[in-house]
């Protein structure tokens, strides 16, 4: 039994890191393998993660961690019984994938303005709380070409757009994702999408 693709890990910079790897053949990850991990810190203890299958030869492990700080470094040991298959380390702050924003809501009761709001996925004491920027994706269910991205580079988790920038009388969907420039993170997953019917009063044409 050998590791074909070494574990690669990403952290949500809060409490969970996810490591994935591939074996050289079909493997029952949960019964055959164990991933041991430990924060390099005087007051830390070793933890064991039981991996799940992720395709025939693929394995994935969700590591429960202490609140992350930038200096953290974890040792990782992948075991098959008594055999050490791989040894490595992981700095969560260097491989961050933020949590997805939640509670995306479209407020249509403001006169001819759409207000989209969502929740920051981090608590206020987390470093990323004040460092996230967002991308909002809005698309038409009727017209695949009607697809747009709004970059929200300020801290407030909201976006205002004129209803008239979208077509009237049809349904739209929106979703939002996040990233943090400070740690050069990847984008988060998209939030669940929300749907609304876009309607507004067309201004009278002057002749």
């Amino acid at each position: 039994m050998k590791v074909l693709q070494e574990p690669t890990c990403v952290s949500d910079y809060m409490s969970i890191s996810t490591c994935e790897w591939k074996m050289n053949g079909p493997t029952n990850c949960s019964t055959e393998l164990r991933l041991l991990y430990q924060l390099v810190f005087l007051l830390s203890e070793a933890h064991t993660c039981i991996p799940e299958n992720n395709g025939g030869a693929g394995c994935v492990c969700h590591l429960l961690m202490d609140d992350v700080v930038s200096a953290d470094n974890y040792t990782l040991d992948l075991w098959a019984g008594q055999q050490l298959l791989w040894k490595g380390s992981f700095k969560p702050s260097e491989h961050v994938k933020p949590r997805a924003p939640g509670n995306l809501t479209v407020h249509t009761n403001v006169s001819d303005t759409l207000l989209l709001t969502w929740s920051n996925p981090y608590p206020p004491d987390n470093y990323l709380y004040n460092h996230l920027t967002y991308a909002v994706n809005i698309w038409s269910e009727n017209d695949p070409a009607d697809f747009r991205i709004y970059n929200v580079t300020y801290l407030e988790p909201s976006l205002r757009i004129a209803a008239s920038t979208l077509k009237s009388g049809i349904s739209y969907r929106a979703r939002v994702r996040a990233w943090a420039q400070c740690y050069n993170t990847t984008w988060s997953e998209w939030s669940p999408s929300t749907k609304w019917h876009n309607s507004y009063r067309e201004p009278f044409e002057q002749h």
Partner: antibody
Framework: EVQLVQSGGGLVHPGGSLRLSCAGS????????MFWVRQAPGKGLEWVSG???????SYADSVKGRFTISRDNAKNSLYLQMNSLRAEDMAVYYC?????????WGQGTLVTVSS | EIVLTQSPGTLSLSPGERATLSCRAS???????LAWYQQKPGQAPRLLIF???SRAPGIPDRFSGSGSGTDFTLTISRLEPEDFAVYYC??????????FGQGTKVEIK
């Protein structure tokens, strides 16, 4: 807002015991290492003890065998049981959250050791 | 055990002046594990700098940290009245734990 609120200081005779408490709020207590740091009157800061999220502990040589640090994650609380107290243990004791450094501190509680 | 020595013991300066505080370690310290604190009379210490040079949230940019190995510096570019206080450096070591310097008092000249 992260807050650490301390209680339990006071006057104790040499050789006596005292228990300090620290209640945390505004953060996930169970995912953070916690510490006690003290400051003798007119002196500098001295690290006393720390406890990890899994319960691993460490102590300064000056208090080893006499002080015991513990935590109750269900109550978001940190404790320091101080036994066989000496005159040199007299100080303001601070609880703190942190790891390699201490990012949030309690308000401090004075422990006076005097006969 | 790593010993941290701060200098000077007292720094007498006027508001608006630049303050340079030194912290010297008896052996090499990882930049990741060097921090600076400010303490005012009757108050708990406040984290200013971690990782030798990163400002803690809410700390004004007139505070900056630098250095590596055994020599570290806290600089206050332009002293404000509220900056007169005692400043401590602190290090963490995987085997020995946490130690503080003896402090530098920044007082009004």
């Amino acid at each position: 807002e992260v807050q650490l609120v301390q209680s339990g200081g006071g006057l104790v005779h040499p050789g006596g015991s005292l228990r300090l408490s620290c209640a945390g709020s505004g953060f996930t207590f169970s995912r953070n290492a916690m510490f006690w740091v003290r400051q003798a009157p007119g002196k500098g800061l001295e690290w006393v003890s720390g406890i990890g999220t899994g319960g691993a502990t460490s102590y300064a040589d000056s208090v080893k065998g006499r002080f015991t640090i513990s935590r109750d994650n269900a109550k978001n609380s940190l404790y320091l049981q101080m036994n066989s107290l000496r005159a040199e243990d007299m100080a303001v004791y601070y609880c703190a959250r942190g790891r390699y450094y201490f990012d949030y501190w309690g308000q401090g509680t004075l422990v006076t050791v005097s006969s | 055990e790593i010993v941290l020595t701060q200098s000077p013991g007292t720094l007498s300066l006027s508001p608006g002046e630049r303050a340079t505080l030194s912290c010297r370690a008896s052996q090499s310290v990882s930049n990741s594990y060097l921090a600076w604190y400010q303490q005012k009379p009757g108050q708990a210490p406040r984290l200013l700098i971690f990782g030798a040079s990163s400002r803690a949230p809410g700390i004004p940019d007139r505070f900056s940290g630098s250095g590596s190995g055994t020599d570290f510096t806290l600089t206050i570019s332009r002293l404000e009245p509220e900056d007169f206080a005692v400043y401590y450096c602190q290090q963490y070591d995987h085997s020995a734990g946490w130690t503080f310097g003896q402090g530098t008092k920044v007082e009004i000249k």
